[in-house]
C-alpha cells in the first residue's frame, strides 16, 4: 500500500518560517501534489501549493517557494511574517495523486520538542490508507 510522509521543520534563522517536506512511497507516477494547512484539503484545509510535474507549480501566500525535490517528493517554504503566518501547532497536509491508482494523503505538524533547525525523520504518517 502506498504511503505518504510529511516532515515539518522550523528554520533556525527565521523562527516563524517553516519548511514542509512530503514524499510518496509507492510505485505510481505522481500526477499532482497538493499541500494544505489547517487540515486535509477536503476537510477544511486551505491550499498552499499545487505542484504538477509537467504544468508547473502554483502557490499562494504565505507559501514562498514550492519545488520538486525528486519525482516523488516536494518541499515548501512558508513565509513567517503577517497575519496568515503559521504557528507551532499548525497542521500541514500533503496529498499525492497518482493515475490511475488514486490519491494518498498525510498530515504532520512541528514536533512539540523540536529545536529550530532540527528536523524530524521522514517517517510515514498516513491518515488515509487503501483498504
Amino acid at each position: 500500500t502506498p504511503e505518504v510522509w510529511v516532515q515539518v521543520r522550523m528554520e533556525a534563522t527565521e523562527l516563524s518560517s517553516f519548511t514542509i517536506r512530503c514524499g510518496f512511497l509507492g510505485s505510481g507516477s505522481i500526477s499532482l501534489v497538493t499541500v494544505s494547512w489547517g487540515g486535509p484539503n477536503g476537510a477544511g484545509g486551505t491550499t498552499l501549493a499545487v505542484l504538477h510535474p509537467e504544468r508547473g507549480i502554483r502557490q499562494w501566500a504565505p507559501a514562498r517557494q514550492a519545488r520538486w525535490e525528486t519525482q516523488s517528493s516536494i518541499s515548501l517554504i512558508l513565509e513567517g511574517s503577517g497575519a496568515s503566518s503559521p504557528c507551532a501547532n499548525t497542521t500541514f497536509c500533503c496529498k499525492f495523486a497518482s493515475f490511475p491508482e488514486g490519491s494518498w494523503e498525510a498530515c504532520g505538524s512541528l514536533p512539540p520538542s523540536s529545536d529550530p533547525g532540527l528536523s524530524a525523520p521522514p517517517t510515514p504518517a498516513p491518515i488515509l490508507r487503501a483498504d
Partner: antibody, heavy 120, light 107 residues
Framework: EVQLVESGGGLVKPGGSLRLSCAAS????????MSWVRQAPGKCLELVSA????????YYLDTVKGRFTISRDNAKNSLYLQMNSLRAEDTAVYYC?????????????WGQGTLVTVSS | DIVMTQSPDSLAVSLGERATINCKAS??????VAWYQQKPGQPPKLLIY???HRFTGVPDRFSGSGSGTDFTLTISSLQAEDVAVYFC?????????FGCGTKLEIK
C-alpha cells in the same frame, strides 16, 4: 475547442472482436490521462479502462481483464480499446473521456459515444 | 471498491424550486468527488469537481457540498433545461466509481 470522437462500434457476435478508436483534438493530448467509460441500457456508468498520459500505467475493470487492451498513440492524438472475446454483457455505449489532474481526475470532456452490441 | 450510493433514484421538483441530490461513499473519498449531468442521447457533462467547484460555463444555480463520505448536489432554482440524470463520481481510489444516477423531472 476540445473534441473527442469515438468510432469502431458495431454489432458483433459473442466471442468476436472490435477495436474502438477515439480521435482527440483541441488540446495537448499527450498531457492528459484518458479513459473508456461504458453505459449499458438501464445500468450505471462503469469505468472500463484507463491509461495515463505517457501510456505506461493502465487500469482495467475486473470483468474485462485479459480481454480488453487500452493503448494510445500520442503522435496521432488517438486512444484505442481493443476488445476481444466479447460477451453479451459488454453491450453498451462506450465513451472516451479526458481526465483533468487539476480537477481531482474528474472527466472534464467526453466523446459522444459509440454503441457496441454483442449478440448472436 | 468504493461504492457511491445516490439518493433518491428519481426526483420531481417544480420549476423555480430547489432540487437536492445526495451521494454517500462507502469510505472517505477526501474531496475527489465530481457531479455529472446527462441528458437523453448525450454523453455526461461535468458540472462540479472537487466537491464544490463549478466547471466552466456551469450556471451558478448548481452547487456542490459535503466532505468525507457525504456529498450533495443542489440546484437552487430548477429550470426546464435541468431535466436530466445526475451522477456522482469518486476519483479518490482506483477503481473510479459512479453513483447509479438520480433522474430529475419537473413536477
Amino acid at each position: 475547442e476540445v473534441q473527442l470522437v469515438e468510432s469502431g462500434g458495431g454489432l458483433v457476435k459473442p466471442g468476436g472482436s472490435l477495436r474502438l478508436s477515439c480521435a482527440a483534438s483541441g488540446f495537448t493530448f499527450s498531457s492528459y490521462h484518458m479513459s473508456w467509460v461504458r453505459q449499458a441500457p438501464g445500468k450505471c456508468l462503469e469505468l472500463v479502462s484507463a491509461i495515463n498520459s505517457n501510456g505506461i500505467n493502465t487500469y482495467y475493470l475486473d470483468t474485462v481483464k485479459g480481454r480488453f487492451t487500452i493503448s494510445r498513440d500520442n503522435a496521432k492524438n488517438s486512444l484505442y480499446l481493443q476488445m476481444n472475446s466479447l460477451r453479451a454483457e459488454d453491450t453498451a455505449v462506450y465513451y472516451c473521456a479526458r481526465h483533468e489532474d487539476y480537477y481531482g481526475f474528474a472527466m472534464d470532456y467526453w466523446g459522444q459515444g459509440t454503441l457496441v452490441t454483442v449478440s448472436s | 471498491d468504493i461504492v457511491m450510493t445516490q439518493s433518491p433514484d428519481s426526483l420531481a421538483v417544480s420549476l423555480g424550486e430547489r432540487a437536492t441530490i445526495n451521494c454517500k461513499a462507502s469510505q472517505s473519498v477526501s474531496n475527489d468527488v465530481a457531479w455529472y449531468q446527462q441528458k437523453p442521447g448525450q454523453p455526461p457533462k461535468l458540472l462540479i469537481y472537487y466537491v464544490s467547484h463549478r466547471f466552466t460555463g456551469v450556471p451558478d444555480r448548481f452547487s456542490g457540498s459535503g466532505s468525507g463520505t457525504d456529498f450533495t448536489l443542489t440546484i437552487s432554482s430548477l429550470q426546464a433545461e435541468d431535466v436530466a440524470v445526475y451522477f456522482c463520481h469518486q476519483a479518490y481510489r482506483s477503481p473510479w466509481t459512479f453513483g447509479c444516477g438520480t433522474k430529475l423531472e419537473i413536477k
